[in-house]
Amino acid sequence: THLGIRLPLRSGLAGPPLGLRLPRETDEESEEPGRRGSFVEMVDNLRGKSGQGYYVEMTVGSPPQTLNILVDTGSSNFAVGAAPHPFLHRYYQRQLSSTYRDLRKGVYVPYTQGKWEGELGTDLVSIPHGPNVTVRANIAAITESDKFFINGSNWEGILGLAYAEIARPDDSLEPFFDSLVKQTHIPNIFSLQLCGAGFPLNQTEALASVGGSMIIGGIDHSLYTGRLWYTPIRREWYYEVIIVRVEINGQDLKMDCKEYNYDKSIVDSGTTNLRLPKKVFEAAVKSIKAASSTEKFPDGFWLGEQLVCWQAGTTPWNIFPVISLYLMGEVTNQSFRITILPQQYLRPVEDVATSQDDCYKFAVSQSSTGTVMGAVIMEGFYVVFDRARKRIGFAVSACHVHDEFRTAAVEGPFVTADMEDCGYNIPQTDESTLMTGRA
């Protein structure tokens, strides 16, 4: 489910932790499941090139075959290239694995543009820079695809970390993380720190870049500053959450909060942009344009198509507003807000102008399938997917890109009434609820 604007993604160099480290609040420490403190073996285990996805190294089969796998919280299949493809340097060779078991079942996943299809099986899987365990997991061996793999992206498969409800061909196919938790003593929690580059990377830098961390089984306190704030997972399919208010530079968009979650709001590491429902997008862009009106940009820029360039080092970050999303809190009538900077929502693009320029794409876009909090949001924060307690945590990422005047923020509590009314109830039909290829 990664086409349209879902992928390619962006990652890049993880700079040193920037800005002041806030004193850690300890009132929630006891509530955090899993191992606490350091997961040093998992830190910096993600890589990625600008706009092309965050991936983790995994091994499948016996003897182990090493593959780079895209980390995607917006889908639920573990699927890997299993046949030659022009864009793949390597692929899973089932015939070389003594532990491969064929499930004698096919899987077909169409997108708005493109598709992948393959054959289901199980095999032994491990994550070299992850927990020291090997699990038997379902694998979709991709035998045919169209517009799925990305030339030069360096990943050969996708790790869907969402819930079984949206697995293909149906919810009986156990997702990888469920298998991992079931077969080991690893707590039912993982966390992601995606580190955006914040500046255009040349090819040498991009290839050598550190993309971030996927911590399996807990929370690493070195990856964030301040405290973690949690929002309930509304329903276990996608990682669905509820947005209760949106502000641009502190100005409320003043829309019925149902609009923000029409038809859902999800946290998706497999999407590049912050994607907003049509009405919300239009209101947000109008507000962002007004806030940055000392300079005008072509319509194509606001559509995410044209690039705008400034002489290297002169990007006028100060003219662009911050974007704040208020999320339902864990306590009744309480919310918290996450605030991102233009350094997150203006996505650096390399190799288009000259080395004397910094060029960017506007990475907020329109959606017909609800709000998608993609890399644009996640690169500002350390995001905890606390499946055990059915909640998602946000804290300011230690690697987020900012300047001397503003920083990304996670702040609360705020009093917000009737937040339950903000959720949209999708009418039940006989058709599958999975909307692939969110255009």
């Epitope: 194509g300 198509e305 044209q306 360039c309 288009v352 060029c359």
Partner: antibody, heavy 120, light 108 residues
């Protein structure tokens, strides 16, 4: 009908500063719908973009000329100006001012151009 | 840097003939491309914007096509006043900065 007219000296000595002004008539330079720009064309050669300005004073310059170029706007006179310092013979060209319309994307209206020769 | 390459450098044709001019970008510029006409001693004039839209007052014999990296300006039947130099320009990277080297359409 909106028109653009370049003015300024036709001869500039090497190492001096080239100064040109573009007067906008038949419309307001303060329109929020346009940027205003300078383009040049050396004799017998192609077009080279120099830079743009918005009525608010926001500027964009060609990186290859950035260190020598200043574009400014005077909304009270309905004019915008170009200054190019430390000129050499390579700066000899016809200099055009133009309006960047069609959603700030395309140079849809041009002045007639003025030839500036750099010579001692 | 995006480079625009125009071909041919010179096109020798007779009035009434069809002219086909090419502009190739070194990487995709989507549909953000314009065509200009320049006659000797005159300023350039915008003919086509967004790859295929005719600018105000431009005759229907001028048409533009293409997207991505390959673009074409077609003059369906050359009139005497069409003999000029034609330039393409990309605005995918903004502000617009890159012009092609030009194609001269001359009388055969």
């Amino acid at each position: 009908q909106l028109q653009l007219q370049e003015s300024g000296p036709g001869l500039v000595k090497p190492s001096e500063t080239l100064s040109l002004t573009c007067t906008v008539s038949g419309g307001s330079i303060s329109s929020s719908s346009y940027y205003w720009g300078w383009i040049r064309q050396p004799p017998g050669k192609g077009l080279e973009w120099i830079g743009n300005i918005y009525y608010s004073g926001s500027t964009y310059y060609n990186p290859s000329l950035k260190s020598r170029v200043t574009i400014s706007v005077d909304t009270s006179k309905n004019q915008f100006s170009l200054k190019l310092s430390s000129v050499t013979a390579a700066d000899t060209a016809v200099y055009y001012c133009a309006r960047l319309g069609h959603g700030y994307n395309y140079f849809d209206l041009w002045g007639r151009g003025t030839l500036v020769t750099v010579s001692s | 840097e995006i480079v625009l390459t125009q071909s041919p450098a010179t096109l020798s044709l007779s009035p009434g003939e069809r002219a086909t001019l090419s502009c190739r970008a070194s990487q995709s510029v989507s549909s953000y491309l314009a065509w200009f006409q320049q006659k000797p001693g005159q300023a350039p004039r915008l003919l086509i914007y967004d790859a295929s839209n005719r600018a105000t007052g431009i005759p229907a014999r001028f048409s533009g096509s293409g997207s991505g990296t390959d673009f074409t300006l077609t003059i369906s039947s050359l009139e005497p006043e069409d003999f000029a130099v034609y330039y393409c320009q990309q605005v995918y990277v903004w502000p617009p900065r890159t012009f092609g080297g030009g194609t001269k359409v001359e009388i055969k």
